[in-house]
Each structure stands twice: as C-alpha cells, then as structure tokens.
C-alpha cells in the first residue's frame, strides 16, 4: 500500500510552536489563540545521500498546504524556506530531492533536523517569539535546535 506521511505538532523546550504566517514559518507561544501547523514527515526512499550517523532522511511539509521545507543559499548563507510542493510528489520521485531533505535524528525525547544540502546547518527557533524558523550552525543557548514531535489526531 502507498506510504502516508506522519503528522505531528512541533514544539520546543520553551513551549513555542510553529505557526504559518503568510508563506513563512514563525515560532509562537503555545496558546489557544494561535493555530500551530501540523508537520508532515515522510522518509526518503532513495539512499544516495544517506548517513545513518546523522539520522534518517526525511521530507518535511505542512499538512493541508502544498508547502514543503526547502534549503537554499541566499547571499552565500544557507536559508530555510517554504516552497510550493506536495510532500507526496517528493516522496514518489525515484531520485532524492536534496534541497528538500533533512536528517532527522533523535536526541533523547527530542528531534533534530539537519539540512542534507548544508551539513552542520540545523533547523532552529530563536529565544524570541514571532521570529522565523531558520537554519543555524550554532547549536546552544541562543538557538533552539531540539524539538518535540507531538502526535496529533
């Protein structure tokens, strides 16, 4: 049977969730007045770029929208973007779509997402509310790169 993406709400240790603002993803406090995105996650079938030490290769999309997370270089810096793309279109491609790929690694009960196109660059939220989700190579105090994937019905 055809594979289906897994659905999660995504949250960090400061109880910030991911929210769609226009065509951007921002971090906002978990709140009744804010509708967090449901993240779609599906494994890549092609093993060309696989590296088990870094985690499983996955595509990340926004449920209910034809939007997927995508890494591209802007002014020489790896940048996280949303691109109009159906996650299942990426999945059915025989060849791995590298800019859309992330290494999904588990660290304790949290998940970490590293760009396949830009090794050492991780999906992150800043400590300030309302800021875009971004890529960073600085893991630590000022950036949060560990996320909780909460099951949603």
């Amino acid at each position: 049977r055809e594979a289906a993406p897994k659905s999660y709400a995504i949250r960090d240790s400061r109880q910030m969730v991911w929210v769609l603002s226009g065509n951007s993803l921002i971090a906002a406090p978990l709140s009744r007045s804010i509708k967090p995105v449901t993240l779609h996650l599906i494994a890549c079938r092609d093993t060309e770029f696989s590296d088990k030490e870094k985690g499983n290769m996955v595509y990340l999309g926004i449920k209910g929208k034809d939007l997927c997370l995508f890494c591209a270089e802007i002014q020489g810096k790896p940048t996280l973007q949303l691109k109009e793309k159906n996650i299942m279109d990426l999945y059915v491609e025989k060849k791995a779509q590298k800019p859309f790929l992330f290494f999904h690694n588990k660290e304790g009960s949290t998940s970490v997402f590293q760009s396949v196109s830009y090794p050492g660059w991780f999906i992150a939220t800043s400590t300030t509310s309302g800021q875009p989700i971004f890529l960073t190579k600085e893991r630590g105090i000022t950036n949060n790169t560990n996320f909780y994937l909460d099951s949603v019905e």
Epitope: A9, Q15, L30, S31, T110, D150, S151
Partner: antibody
Framework: ELQLQESGPGLVKPSETLSLTCTVS??????????WGWIRQPPGKGLEWIGS???????YYNPSLKSRVTISVDTSKNQFSLKLSSVTAADTAVYYC??????????????WGQGTLVTVSS | ESVLTQPPSVSGAPGQRVTISCTGS?????????VHWYQQLPGTAPKLLIY???NRPSGVPDRFSGSKSGTSASLAITGLQAEDEADYYC???????????FGGGTKLTVL
C-alpha cells in the same frame, strides 16, 4: 474521568528528603501531550510551581528549587513522584499534583489532586 | 515575590461586579502565553476557572470571565454571590524561566 491522588509521609525531618507520589486514575500517564506537575502552598500563602514532567519524560523545574528537586514517572504503576532534598521548615506546605494537556489546556492545569500536607519538623 | 502580581484582596457586595488584575512581563503574559485563573475555596484544592485567557471549562458559570491585554490580564465576576468568597490565582508560562508561574493570589470577600 482523570483523577489524581497524592500520597506520602506527612512529617519529614529537617535535612532529609521529602518523597511524594501522585497516582493517576482514569487515564494513562503515557498518553500523548499530557504534562504532570507538582505545586505547593505553604500555610496561609500562595501557590508555587515546583516542577513538571511530560509524556515524553522531559522534566522542567522551578529555578529556585532546581538543585533540590527530582520528578520522575513510574509507568508500570501509573504514578509520578516528587523528591525534594535537604528540606527545611520553609518547605512545610500542602503539596498538590496537577495535570494538563498541551493542545487543550495550553499550559494550564485542569485536574488537581486534593493535596497533602507535609510538615518539616524534628 | 511572585512573578505575576495580583492585589492581595478585593471585596464587593452581593450582586456587584468585581475585577482582579494580574500583571506580568514581556517573558510571560507579554510574550503571548495564555493566562489561566483558579478559584480556591477555603480548605480545598484550586479549581480551573478560566483557561486560555477567556475560556470557561464546562460547569463554570458565565458570571466569570477573563480578558488579556499586553502584559496584564483580568478576571471579572458579575452578580457576586456569597459562595464566590475564595482565593483567586492567575497563572501563565514564562519562557525565561522555562516554567509555569503563578500570581500571589487575591482574597475575595463578599460583604
């Protein structure tokens, strides 16, 4: 319906460790998106959050108590517990366990135990 | 000293309207975390009265309402009744502490 019940000694000696357990009934402690907390209330005073543990096993502690607090879960008994070390008379309080659900109560606590009074005295 | 500030006491006659304020900062209420209100009747455990700033759990009378603006929140009680005499606490989340915070509590006296 989810219910919580605190248990543990009502009297603890100074410098010893206070140990309390909260038994969860009417639901599983491992159910997705739940968080479980300990809150205390010294006699005649207000509520103070001690710490929490959630369904992932992640713990969060009040910075003012962090060095003395441990919260853990026993999934086989459907319980979570509090340990507070090196207690003094200032730790005398009614201790409550409480729970909420991330995407339903939004970091509030909608179910509480009835509370248990712990006195620190020699 | 509590992270969230409430008046120690308020009072009102039966049938009147009273409000209880809760003032936080840019790392809790002002950061858009929700405010929750609890009622604690004498000798009992706190009970959730308002969650998510302005929502009543089932069974809570519509005489109780909550609101939030900026770094502050308020609980309003209309048509005050003798059984409303209790302590009221506000609560939120503070990202700088990575934890839950309470107000110091407000004692409501029905005259």
């Amino acid at each position: 319906e989810l219910q919580l019940q605190e248990s543990g000694p009502g009297l603890v000696k100074p410098s010893e460790t206070l140990s309390l357990t909260c038994t969860v009934s009417g639901g599983s402690i491992t159910s997705s998106n739940y968080y479980w907390g300990w809150i205390r209330q010294p006699p005649g005073k207000g509520l103070e959050w001690i710490g929490s543990i959630d369904y992932t096993g992640s713990t969060y502690y009040n910075p003012s108590l962090k060095s003395r607090v441990t919260i853990s879960v026993d999934t086989s008994k459907n319980q979570f517990s509090l340990k507070l070390s090196s207690v003094t008379a200032a730790d005398t309080a009614v201790y409550y366990c409480a729970t909420g659900k991330y995407y339903e109560t939004y970091l509030g606590f909608d179910v509480w135990g009835q509370g248990t009074l712990v006195t620190v005295s020699s | 000293e509590s992270v969230l500030t409430q008046p120690p006491s308020v009072s009102g006659a039966p049938g009147q309207r009273v409000t209880i304020s809760c003032t936080g900062s840019s790392s809790n209420i002002g950061a858009h975390y929700d405010v929750h209100w609890y009622q604690q009747l004498p000798g009992t455990a706190p009970k959730l009265l308002i969650y998510g700033n302005d929502n009543r759990p089932s069974g809570v009378p519509d005489r109780f309402s909550g609101s939030k603006s900026g770094t502050s929140a308020s609980l309003a009680i209309t048509g005050l009744q003798a059984e409303d005499e209790a302590d009221y606490y506000c609560q939120s989340y503070d990202y700088s502490l990575s934890g839950y915070v309470f107000g110091g509590g407000t004692k409501l006296t029905v005259l």
